[in-house]
């Protein structure tokens, strides 16, 4: 499995998970692939406490999270239920805005500079956060 007993170097432990904060930028799909190659996934935000932790470590930067509606409904990359889970959208979001002129709407979610979420064009290059579970049982 992908669970670990301690976090890898340069990863930050919080509440049973390990987090890695990028310093470069990538489109959502490339960020998602990067996390998978690290046996992790784009961060799944499940609580206000986790949201606050992430904000403290990210700084005020647009940062991809593991939430997308590229397949229709909004879904977290690890299968966590979107409908019943924590949500922290900016007011008026998500809006699937077409006005950017790049074709299509907006299908990937990111932290904005104030930490609340926005949907944006998935191919925009933003920072990202990877997350993997920490196995405390071993």
């Amino acid at each position: 499995g992908s669970e670990r007993t301690c976090c890898p170097i340069n990863w930050v432990e919080y509440e049973g998970s390990c987090y890695w904060f990028s310093s470069s930028v990538r489109p959502w799909t490339e960020a998602d692939k990067y996390c998978q190659l690290e046996n992790a996934h784009l961060v799944v935000v499940t609580s206000r406490d986790e949201q606050n932790f992430l904000q403290r470590h990210m700084g005020p930067l647009n940062t991809w999270i593991g939430l997308t509606d590229q397949n229709g409904p909004w879904k977290w990359v690890d299968g966590t239920d979107y409908e019943t889970g924590f949500q922290n959208w900016r007011p008026e979001q998500p809006d699937n805005w077409y006005g950017h002129g790049l074709g299509g709407g907006e299908d990937c979610a990111h932290f904005t500079t104030d930490g609340r979420w926005n949907d944006d064009v998935c191919r925009r290059p933003y920072r990202w956060v990877c997350e993997t579970k920490l196995d405390k049982a071993n």
Epitope: D69, N71, W74, E83, W89, E92, Q93, P94, G104, G105
Partner: antibody, heavy 117, light 107 residues
Framework: EVQLVESGGGLVKPGGSLRLSCAAS????????MNWVRQAPGKGLEWVSS????????YYADSVKGRFTISRDNAKNSLYLQMNSLRAEDTAVYFC??????????WGQGTLVTVSS | DIQMTQSPSSLSASVGDRVTITCRAS??????LNWYQQKPGKAPKLLIY???SLQSGVPSRFSGSGSGTDFTLTISSLQPEDFATYYC?????????FGPGTKVDIK
């Protein structure tokens, strides 16, 4: 289960008005763009209007612009289409559907609007 | 506005046949092309989104391809329940537009 149910269709005279409703259930309604699509008897599909999750962005087909108004009430999980100055060519089955750039899914069962004197 | 055309407008086929329907956009829509199936008296059903992604629950005999202006829907082995009308739709930009449809009936 994700479900959309339209209502409000019926027979109306030319120049009259009608308000269609679409009741949504089984998903976080405010997170999704919603749409109206119509189909005249024996004809193909025609996109009518779209509205973003928070009503920030609204779009209309030229054929209905200035006559139809799309709106939503996220507290009631409902989508509406106010149709004014109706014409014979507006006769169609009207469908509501969820979604945007990744296609419309699901669709409601449709409600028939007949404009005739 | 982006115009969508489909060919053929109708076709007759037998169970087991391989069926191909084409859709053309009047300008590039990159991959923002969706395919729907509609049976008489029913609402349309999403089959393929963004040109080639199979909608959840749709049989794998349906596939889509193409990008830019030219797109194809293929049914690898036609089944009795596949006799219906098929529509393409662009979701690249507003106003969204549908193709005129292709009716697939029994030979």
């Amino acid at each position: 289960e994700v479900q959309l149910v339209e209502s409000g269709g019926g027979l109306v005279k030319p120049g009259g008005s009608l308000r269609l409703s679409c009741a949504a259930s089984g998903f976080t309604f405010s997170s999704y763009s919603m749409n109206w699509v119509r189909q005249a008897p024996g004809k193909g599909l025609e996109w009518v209007s779209s509205i973003s999750g928070s009503s920030s962005y609204i779009y209309y087909a030229d054929s209905v612009k200035g006559r139809f108004t799309i709106s939503r009430d996220n507290a009631k999980n409902s989508l509406y289409l106010q149709m004014n100055s109706l014409r014979a060519e507006d006769t169609a089955v009207y469908f509501c559907a969820r979604g945007g750039s990744r296609g419309f899914d699901p669709w409601g069962q449709g409600t028939l609007v007949t404009v005739s004197s | 506005d982006i115009q969508m055309t489909q060919s053929p407008s109708s076709l007759s086929a037998s169970v087991g046949d391989r069926v191909t329907i084409t859709c053309r956009a009047s300008q590039s829509i990159t991959s923002y092309l969706n395919w729907y199936q509609q049976k008489p008296g029913k609402a349309p059903k999403l089959l393929i989104y963004t040109a080639s992604s199979l909608q959840s629950g749709v049989p794998s005999r349906f596939s889509g391809s193409g990008s830019g202006t030219d797109f194809t829907l293929t049914i690898s082995s036609l089944q009795p329940e596949d006799f219906a009308t098929y529509y393409c739709q662009q979701s690249h930009s507003f106003p969204f537009t549908f193709g005129p449809g292709t009716k697939v009936d029994i030979k």
